[in-house]
Interface confidence: low
């Protein structure tokens, strides 16, 4: 790990990454891009998942929280020889597959997925994968493109969930590096703090959710804060403001001191949460206090 | 068994109010989108509007957004299509329907609608 | 106006195949359904997802999906597929649900 910005979010990461022909030279920059992004992403809570397309995609790595298994999933990752065609919606459908079965405790884990192709998908190739990115989307899943050398960013703006979640590396692949810290910062949703983290026990409290990201939603009216009660009911609330660094919610009332809400934040009308280690917790409080 | 169960349609003066609901049984109506589509005597089927499971996100079509609104309780199990200003335009057969696959209404993903009410008429006259 | 276009009217003799279709911009990116209504009563979707068949529904019915046409095939047509047929997708802004004008089928 090098230090520099870190992602505390606790969310599903999938790398989608091209294999095909075209990259045969260039895996290297690939396989550092990667290795050098995954680190910075540091929760305990995040999982990851390497998939690689060709003329068919393949999950490198399932998903795992397991830092062991991650290292090692880097291992094969470098190993791999690419070769064949661009059948990017291989990739996603790897990716949705898993996002499909990966229930944590009954609901959703947010899902992030960086895909990274070098060239222009043509038609069929192209529609197929947009209809894939999007199968994801309705998972619940975030997609950012990267588009390196002979890309078409009007086709990854499509397939990405907006032309601001497009990554452009116009100078060639060894230009990889340089992006690594916007990306960081994009697809990063992270909780780190609800204040207060203490509320009276039977009254009624707004929190203010600090954190980053939230206005990374494609569409902030469907932003949610939730709160799983004592590792059982999970209660959602509209917050009144969505700003990127905080989030403005009605607490719940929690009537008996001593309850425990861990606090989540789901990015798609309550479809799938990010997870965060925030509790927030009832104590007594006198009157006039 | 999953069904939809409708009621409140009937006959309205033109510019009055009307509310109609839809019973939802078999299934847990918080976990789906769900819509609601009209039928003008003779015509073919309009979308009106629709919902995202949680009742975050709604959606109308040009044709009634600002009259309409749609809404659910879903401890009831129940959505509802509010109608203000009503117009003889708007006399149809209204269905209320349960949108396929995840609840959150994304719109890229729109496969179907895979359950229907028995519809109810609304005629809307003086 | 409809996004989606359909012919108004086709028939095919019993035991025969028949295919409706429905054109529109939007399908180019997006899913066609198709529904089943007959007199008096609720549609009943038979087609999802472009070619997904709900169950229940039998197996001479099939749907496909071509460039911005989406089409719907009844092979060995019955007295009991007589009904009117709708195509449906979102439109393509992305916002809305948009069905077609409508195909009246009759079995000869």
């Known amino acids: 790990e090098d230090g520099g910005p870190a992602c505390y979010g606790g969310f599903d990461l999938y790398f989608i990454l091209d294999k095909s022909g075209s990259v045969l030279h260039h895996w290297n920059e690939i396989y550092y891009f990667v290795e050098q992004l995954a680190h910075k992403f540091i929760s305990p809570q995040l999982r990851m998942s390497f998939i690689v397309f060709s003329t068919r995609g393949t999950t490198l790595m399932k998903l795992t929280e397991d830092r062991e298994q991650i290292r090692q999933g880097l291992e094969e990752l470098q190993k791999v020889l690419p070769g064949g065609d661009t059948y990017m919606h291989e990739g996603f459908e790897r990716a949705s597959e898993q996002i499909y079965y990966e229930n944590r405790q009954g609901y959703r884990t947010a899902s992030v997925i960086i895909a990274l192709t070098d060239g222009e998908l043509h038609e069929d190739l192209f529609f197929y994968s947009e209809r894939e990115a999007n199968r994801s989307r309705d998972l619940g899943a975030i997609v950012y493109c990267v588009g390196v050398k002979d890309f078409n960013e009007t086709q990854l703006a499509r397939i990405a969930d907006s032309k601001d979640h497009v990554f452009p590396v116009n100078d060639g692949f060894q230009a990889l590096q340089g992006i690594i810290h916007s990306i960081l910062k994009k697809s990063c949703i992270e909780i780190l703090a609800a204040e207060p983290s203490t509320i009276c026990a039977g009254e009624s409290f707004q929190v203010v959710v600090r954190g980053n990201g939230f206005r990374h939603a494609r569409n902030v009216d469907r932003v949610l804060c939730s709160f799983k009660i004592n590792d059982s009911v999970t209660l959602n609330e509209k917050p009144f403001s969505v700003e990127d660094t905080y989030l403005l919610c009605p607490a719940p009332i929690l009537k008996e001191v001593g309850m425990k809400a861990a606090l989540q934040v789901s990015m798609n009308d309550g479809l799938s949460f990010i997870s965060s280690s925030v509790i927030i917790t009832t104590t007594h409080c006198s009157d006039g206090s | 068994q999953v069904q939809l169960v409708q009621s409140g349609g009937g006959v309205v003066q033109p510019g009055r109010p009307l509310r109609l609901s839809c019973a939802a049984s078999?299934?847990?109506?918080?976990?789906?989108?769900m819509s609601w589509v009209r039928q003008a005597p003779g015509k073919g089927l309009e979308w009106v509007s629709a919902?995202?499971?949680?009742?975050?996100?709604?959606y109308y079509a040009d044709s009634v957004k600002g009259r309409f609104t749609i809404s659910r309780d879903n401890s009831k199990n129940t959505l509802y299509l509010q109608m203000n200003s009503l117009r003889a335009e708007d006399t149809a057969v209204y269905y209320c329907?349960?949108?396929?696959?995840?609840?959150?209404?994304?719109?890229?993903?729109?496969?179907?609608?895979?359950?229907w009410g028995q519809g109810t008429t609304v005629t809307v006259s003086s | 106006s409809s996004e989606l276009t359909q012919d108004p009217a086709v028939s095919v003799a019993l035991g025969q195949t028949v295919r409706i279709t429905c054109q529109g911009d939007?399908?180019?990116?997006?899913?066609a359904s198709w529904y089943q209504q007959k007199p008096g009563q609720a549609p009943v979707l038979v087609i999802y997802?472009?070619?997904n068949r709900p169950s229940g529904i039998p197996d001479r019915v099939s749907g496909s999906r071509s460039g911005n046409t989406a089409s719907l095939t009844i092979t060995g047509a019955q007295a009991e597929d007589e009904a009117d047929y709708y195509c449906n997708s979102r439109d393509s802004s992305g916002n809305h649900v948009v069905f077609g004008g409508g195909t009246e089928l009759t079995v000869l």
């Open positions: 329907a349960k949108i396929l696959g995840p609840g959150n209404l994304n719109y890229y993903y729109y496969y179907g609608m895979d359950v």
């Open positions: 939007s399908l180019r990116n997006s899913y």
């Open positions: 997802g472009n070619n």
């Open positions: 078999g299934f847990n109506l918080g976990s789906y989108a």
């Open positions: 919902i995202s499971g949680s009742g975050g996100s709604t």
